[in-house]
């Protein structure tokens, strides 16, 4: 694949990454699939600076990120180590709350209205952010 040196149209460049911000909501799994088919991934927040950048663009709206614990431990979708990495949970979160009445706990992380993170039911239709790194090899074949 060819190396991506600039961001696709409608994506925002920041610190050698490209970001795309949705305007509507999808369940976490649909958002995850959307990003991957764009040769990207749900946003992975690795620093306070990146947190502030994303927060500035999404505003006070619940928005999915690429962090989940659907298979047990918390994992970032790109393999970034969760335990040693940046975290910005709200106080007493994540709590895997079962009291919502929707079945199961809360396995997917999102930005809340103040930017801090919460775990929630993955089926909720929240906005989402895709991220892809510049200078990585693109998987896209030539367009026909």
């Amino acid at each position: 694949g060819s190396e991506r040196t600039c961001c696709p149209v409608n994506w925002v460049e920041h610190e050698r990454s490209c970001y795309w911000f949705s305007r509507s909501g999808k369940a976490w799994a649909d958002a995850d699939n959307y990003c991957r088919l764009e040769d990207a991934h749900l946003v992975v927040v690795t620093s306070w600076e990146e947190q502030k950048f994303v927060q500035h663009h999404i505003g006070p709206v619940n928005t999915w990120m690429g962090l989940h614990d659907q298979n047990g431990p918390w994992k970032w979708v790109d393999g970034t180590d969760y335990e040693t990495g940046f975290k910005n949970w709200r106080p007493e979160q994540p709590d895997d709350w079962y009291g919502h009445g929707l079945g199961g706990g809360e396995d997917c992380a999102h930005f809340t209205d103040d930017g801090r993170w919460n775990d929630d039911v993955c089926q909720r239709p929240y906005r989402w952010v895709c991220e892809t790194e510049l200078d990585k090899a693109s998987q896209e074949p030539p367009l026909l």
């Epitope: 649909d30 699939n33 959307y34 367009l143």
Partner: antibody
């Protein structure tokens, strides 16, 4: 509510062309990748083509590459499929779908002399 | 290309029966699989996404399970409106591919 309405199907001779349209409403069209799927009479479903939300990235099934062109107009909430060099085996009901979530009712394309 | 096989191809059942349909992928597809219901002359309707998530508005008698290569759709107690054709769709990579479908009719 979400609606996808296909149009443009009909009877066409082998070698002919047809342009299908899909009018979308009830959701944020520019936040969805779109796909075309077809179903030949009495057969299973077959994926035809994909277009990213921006319209930049496009993929096609091998048997349709070079003959079919997918496009979209986000300002008009519309998806299109230009089909050229049509063959009898392209006879099918053609569905548009938003992501893999919402599907239209389909439009019938018949290729026959 | 990823091939999807589905079994059974058809089944006869009664109202209240528990029905299970299986799709197998020729290679791993994570959980990028949806289950759909289609009635004659109607648009397909998504029941399950991400292999196990119930689509909003779909009755809880429908459930999905599996990951990787083997996936199951279960209807816990078949209702009259559930007699239809069911198919799976993998969308982890291009080309997207469908299972051939399972027709569920009245015994």
């Amino acid at each position: 509510q979400v609606q996808l309405v296909e149009s443009g199907g009909g009877l066409v001779k082998p070698g002919g062309s047809l342009r299908l349209s899909c009018a979308a409403s009830g959701f944020t069209f520019s936040d969805y990748y779109m796909i075309w799927i077809r179903q030949a009479p009495g057969k299973g479903l077959e994926w035809v083509s994909y277009i990213s939300s921006s319209g930049i990235t496009k993929y096609y099934a091998d048997s349709m590459k070079g003959r079919f062109t997918i496009s979209r107009d986000n300002a008009k909430n519309s998806l299109y499929l230009q089909m050229n060099s049509l063959r009898a085996e392209d006879t099918a009901v053609y569905y548009c779908a938003a992501d893999t979530i919402y599907w239209g009712q389909g439009t019938l394309v018949t290729v026959s002399s | 290309d990823i091939q999807m096989t589905q079994s059974p191809s058809s089944l006869s059942a009664s109202v209240g029966d528990r029905v299970t349909i299986t799709c197998r992928a020729s290679q791993g597809i994570r959980n990028d699989l949806g289950w759909y219901q289609q009635k004659p002359g109607k648009a397909p309707k998504r029941l399950i996404y991400g292999a196990s998530n119930l689509q909003s508005g779909v009755p809880s008698r429908f459930s999905g399970s599996g990951s990787g290569t083997e996936f199951t759709l279960t209807v816990s107690s078949l209702q009259p409106e559930d007699f239809a054709t069911y198919f799976c769709l993998q969308h982890t990579s291009f080309p997207f591919t469908f299972g051939p479908g399972t027709k569920v009719d009245i015994k």
